[in-house]
């Protein structure tokens, strides 16, 4: 008789999860020679220890602390790019602008990007059938707590001018319930961060509205200003052109607003 297994509402652990995390870690240390001495087996052991044998609705930031001890990677604190609901463009940007970093350009972010994982209470098994959904099941699940933990630390490390890419096509350009709105905004350190600069990315080709005047952007400005951090906002009317100009800034067509 098969043992009863908790059925969650979300998709199960990504197939070949241990192998994927280990392979990504090795690849990352090869791409980033400053991390060449990282022992990826130890990284996986710490990652695994955060959720294996634990109830997947009872995960805490404390569970990830052993793994976070690796999170001292020296990303330049003034080259941080946050994003909300526009991950692909943010990543395309940092692939071109190599001296800027999203969370997923750091080792821990790179390891977990787009993956799902959870375990089961009191067994060493990984649950490949289902994992808790943030809304339908519980918020203290392994994936959500991981991203909350690393996002908080990433925001805390930021300094000088911090950039955030926001999706202008969404009804809430700034969403207080997003990771950016609920975690990162509140963990920027006013004594280190001078300005948060928002880049609002337009979706439609003929969209010439000033989305920096959107009520949700004004709400973001209010939250940031109350935290004694300056706020600025720019419309990126043509994201394709924006990327092209990052690649070739000397192009004569890149002088006008994009």
């Amino acid at each position: 008789v098969p043992r009863w297994r908790q059925q969650w509402s979300g998709p199960g652990t990504t197939k070949r999860f241990p192998e994927t995390v280990l392979a990504r870690c090795v690849k990352y240390t090869e791409i980033h020679p400053e991390m060449r001495h990282v022992d990826c087996q130890s990284v996986w052991d710490a990652f695994k220890g955060a959720f294996i044998s634990k109830h997947p609705c009872n995960i805490t930031e404390e569970d990830y602390q052993p793994l976070m001890k690796l999170g001292t990677q020296t990303v330049p604190c003034n080259k941080i790019l946050l994003w909300s609901r526009i991950k692909d463009l943010a990543h395309q940007f940092t692939q071109v602008q190599r001296d800027m970093f999203t969370l997923e350009d750091t080792l821990l972010g790179y390891l977990a990007d787009d993956l799902t994982w959870c375990g089961e209470f009191n067994t060493s098994k990984i649950n490949y059938q289902s994992c808790p959904d943030w809304r339908k099941d519980c918020s203290n699940n392994p994936v959500s707590v991981f991203w909350k933990t690393v996002s908080r630390r990433f925001a805390e490390a930021a300094c000088d001018v911090v950039h955030v890419m926001l999706n202008g096509s969404r009804s809430k350009i700034f969403d207080k319930n997003s990771t950016f709105g609920s975690v990162e905004v509140h963990n920027l350190q006013p004594e280190k961060v001078q300005t948060l600069e928002a880049w609002v990315i337009h979706g439609g080709r003929e969209d010439s509205r000033d989305l920096c005047q959107d009520p949700t952007i004004k709400e973001l400005e209010s939250i940031i200003s109350k935290r004694n951090i300056q706020f600025s906002c720019k419309n990126i009317y043509r994201p394709d052109k924006f990327l092209q100009c990052v690649k070739n800034p000397e192009d004569s067509s890149c002088t006008s607003e994009i």
């Epitope: 400053e34 001495h37 990282v38 022992d39 001890k69 690796l70 001292t72």
Partner: antibody, heavy 118, light 110 residues
Framework: QVQLVESGGGLVKPGGSLRLSCAAS????????MSWIRQAPGKGLEWVAS????????YYADSVRGRFTISRDNAKNSLYLQMNSLRAEDTAVYYC???????????WGQGTLVTVSS | QAGLTQPPSASGTSGQRVTISCSGS????????VYWYQHLPGTAPKLLIY???QRPSGVPDRFSGSKSGNSASLAISGLRSEDEADYYC???????????FGSGTKVTVL
């Protein structure tokens, strides 16, 4: 085969300066991280500084930060250590070392002795 | 600055097995590779073990390395007179953004 030859050691007064050089051959110098490691008389090995390949990033031990500068000249296959504000506790044999792909010191020079004394 | 902790000495008779421990923390050994070096007086140090347990070509298989948690060890089996030397463990340390060496262990063949 890989060869690392240090030079520039000698006797210097406290507060003085010295520049060590390391001539490298037998491998593609510009591809590898390079380091300086020292051993004070009767003491153990102590890492001093490292410099990356590519656009150089430098790393220093707390004991020398702000006083020593590591640099490299890939065109000359040479590694340098500029030592300023020298102290008696900097007296040591200084080794130049090549780093492998996993951070290990694969090849070492024979060392050059630096003596800081009045 | 705090380094890695090694016993000051270890000894054994010819043919015996000797183990040297190296203890650190999560900021060094815990998440980073451990390296072992052999140093004979008046010569350049020599890499014995890298990536916790890998031997460079030319290093006899009498030398083996292992790592568990925040500690590592070097084992020398079939001890020989030419193994008399100082042995150092080393690892990168995140909190220092640099390498740390152990204090060194002098191995004597009785």
């Amino acid at each position: 085969q890989v060869q690392l030859v240090e030079s520039g050691g000698g006797l210097v007064k406290p507060g003085g300066s010295l520049r060590l050089s390391c001539a490298a051959s037998g491998f593609t110098f510009s591809d590898d991280y390079m380091s300086w490691i020292r051993q004070a008389p009767g003491k153990g090995l102590e890492w001093v500084a490292s410099v990356s390949n590519g656009r150089p990033t430098t790393y220093y031990a707390d004991s020398v930060r702000g006083r020593f500068t590591i640099s490299r000249d890939n065109a000359k296959n040479s590694l340098y250590l500029q030592m300023n504000s020298l102290r008696a506790e900097d007296t040591a044999v200084y080794y130049c070392a090549r780093e492998g792909w996993s951070g290990e010191f694969t090849d070492w020079g024979q060392g050059t002795l630096v003596t800081v004394s009045s | 600055q705090a380094g890695l902790t090694q016993p000051p000495s270890a000894s054994g008779t010819s043919g015996q097995r000797v183990t040297i421990s190296c203890s650190g923390s999560s900021s060094n050994i815990g998440f980073h590779f451990v390296y072992w070096y052999q140093h004979l007086p008046g010569t350049a140090p020599k890499l014995l073990i890298y990536k916790n347990n890998q031997r460079p070509s030319g290093v006899p298989d009498r030398f083996s390395g292992s790592k568990s948690g925040n500690s590592a060890s070097l084992a020398i089996s079939g001890l020989r007179s030419e193994d008399e030397a100082d042995y150092y463990c080393a690892a990168w340390d995140d909190s220092l953004s640099g390498y740390v060496f152990g204090s060194g262990t002098k191995v004597t063949v009785l």
